[in-house]
Interface confidence: low
């Protein structure tokens, strides 16, 4: 099966597919990071969820004014986090709720690892991990 089949709603909804990238980001503290969600339709607003640990359920991300910003156009939603901190570590998910069906679709997640000043090289290899 093609990889995009995983995102396709069998009912054929107008916003049944959503792709999130990158899957992993490792950056030093203080840097700015961006993560993106690509949609096949603008039929529905995108929100962002976050979880800090693998066995937690994602929860609504509270955007810190002046440091975290979300934007959305026809087919692209972007979350920008400036001056990343250790407490920003976690997995971020975009989520789209369709206007016409109220169905909800979620990206596969972007893991953010905020590094100190010595271990960034150790994790660079993770950028090449497959889904």
């Amino acid at each position: 099966a093609r990889s995009e089949d995983r995102y396709r709603n069998p009912k054929g909804s107008a916003c049944s597919r959503i792709w999130q990238s990158p899957r992993f980001i490792a950056r030093k503290r203080g840097f700015t990071v961006k993560m993106h969600c690509y949609m096949n339709s603008a039929s529905g607003n995108v929100s962002w969820l976050w979880k800090q640990e693998m066995d937690e359920n994602p929860q609504q991300l509270k955007l810190e004014k002046g440091r975290m910003e979300e934007s959305q156009n026809e087919s692209l939603a972007t979350l920008t986090i400036q001056g990343i901190r250790f407490e920003d570590n976690g997995i971020y998910f975009c989520q789209q709720k369709c206007n016409n069906t109220s169905e909800v679709y979620q990206g596969c997640g972007t893991e953010l690892r905020v590094m100190g000043f010595s271990t960034l090289a150790q994790l660079k290899q993770r950028n090449t991990l497959k889904d």
């Epitope: 640990e53 066995d55 937690e56 509270k62």
Partner: antibody, heavy 121, light 108 residues
Framework: EVQLLESGGGLVQPGGSLRLSCAAS????????MTWVRQAPGKGLEWVSG????????YYADSVKGRFTISRDNSKNTLFLQMNSLSAEDTAVYYC??????????????WGQGTMVTVSS | SSELTQPPSVSVSPGQTARITCSGD??????AYWYQQKSGQAPVLVIY???KRPSGIPERFSGSNSGTMATLTISGAQVEDEAAYYC???????????FGGGTKLTVL
């Protein structure tokens, strides 16, 4: 009906130990983080300790770190708080509380009625 | 760890609007939660994630969080709302949870 029933409180001498238990029922215990909160007589609420759904991650207030140990038995739907080296400052009603979700850092939506711990000689 | 600061007491007449504030450095990036505790009883969650109301909580209870200040508003306070109210959040390290000192609401 969601219920949390604490037990194990009582009178203990300074330096002594107690083990509190909290029996959970009416919800799927294994998918919620859990917390202990205490309230000294006539005082406000004080967060004591929290534990993740799996029990792997535990969190403690500075005032109890190294003396208290939180744990859970998911097979028995029970939360525990082992309290050692108790002092008069630990005298309080101890509440067991269920997290809003699986999130370690969530607030609690359901509380037990509490069990009284008195530390006195 | 961070602290949450509340006024010790607030008094209103029945039918008036009561506002209880909670200030903390971490509140711009952390959710605020509010508990009501009546004398001799366990706390009850009345507001979660800044402004959401659990089922069973009257509509007169509302919450907001702007900057470093969270506010619990009781529109048309009633005698049965007389209680201690506590705000709650995580501190900036996210490893500790913090309660405010509590505010005694008197409706007279």
């Amino acid at each position: 009906e969601v219920q949390l029933l604490e037990s194990g409180g009582g009178l203990v001498q300074p330096g002594g130990s107690l083990r509190l238990s909290c029996a959970a029922s009416g919800f799927t215990f294994t998918i919620y983080a859990m917390t202990w909160v205490r309230q000294a007589p006539g005082k406000g609420l004080e967060w004591v300790s929290g534990i993740s759904v799996s029990g792997i991650r535990t969190y403690y207030a500075d005032s109890v770190k190294g003396r208290f140990t939180i744990s859970r038995d998911n097979s028995k739907n029970t939360l525990f708080l082992q309290m050692n080296s108790l002092s008069a400052e630990d005298t309080a009603v101890y509440y067991c509380a269920k997290g809003l979700s699986s999130g370690d850092r969530d607030a609690s939506d359901i509380w037990g009625q509490g069990t009284m711990v008195t530390v006195s000689s | 760890s961070s602290e949450l600061t509340q006024p010790p007491s607030v008094s209103v007449s029945p039918g008036q609007t009561a506002r209880i504030t909670c200030s903390g450095d971490a509140l711009p990036r952390k959710y605020a939660y509010w508990y009501q505790q009546k004398s001799g009883q366990a706390p009850v969650l009345v507001i979660y994630e800044d402004s959401k109301r659990p089922s069973g909580i009257p509509e007169r209870f509302s919450g907001s969080n702007s900057g470093t200040m969270a506010t619990l508003t009781i529109s048309g306070a009633q005698v049965e709302d007389e209680a201690a109210y506590y705000c709650y959040s995580t501190d900036s390290s996210a490893n500790h949870r913090v309660f405010g000192g509590g505010t005694k609401l008197t409706v007279l």
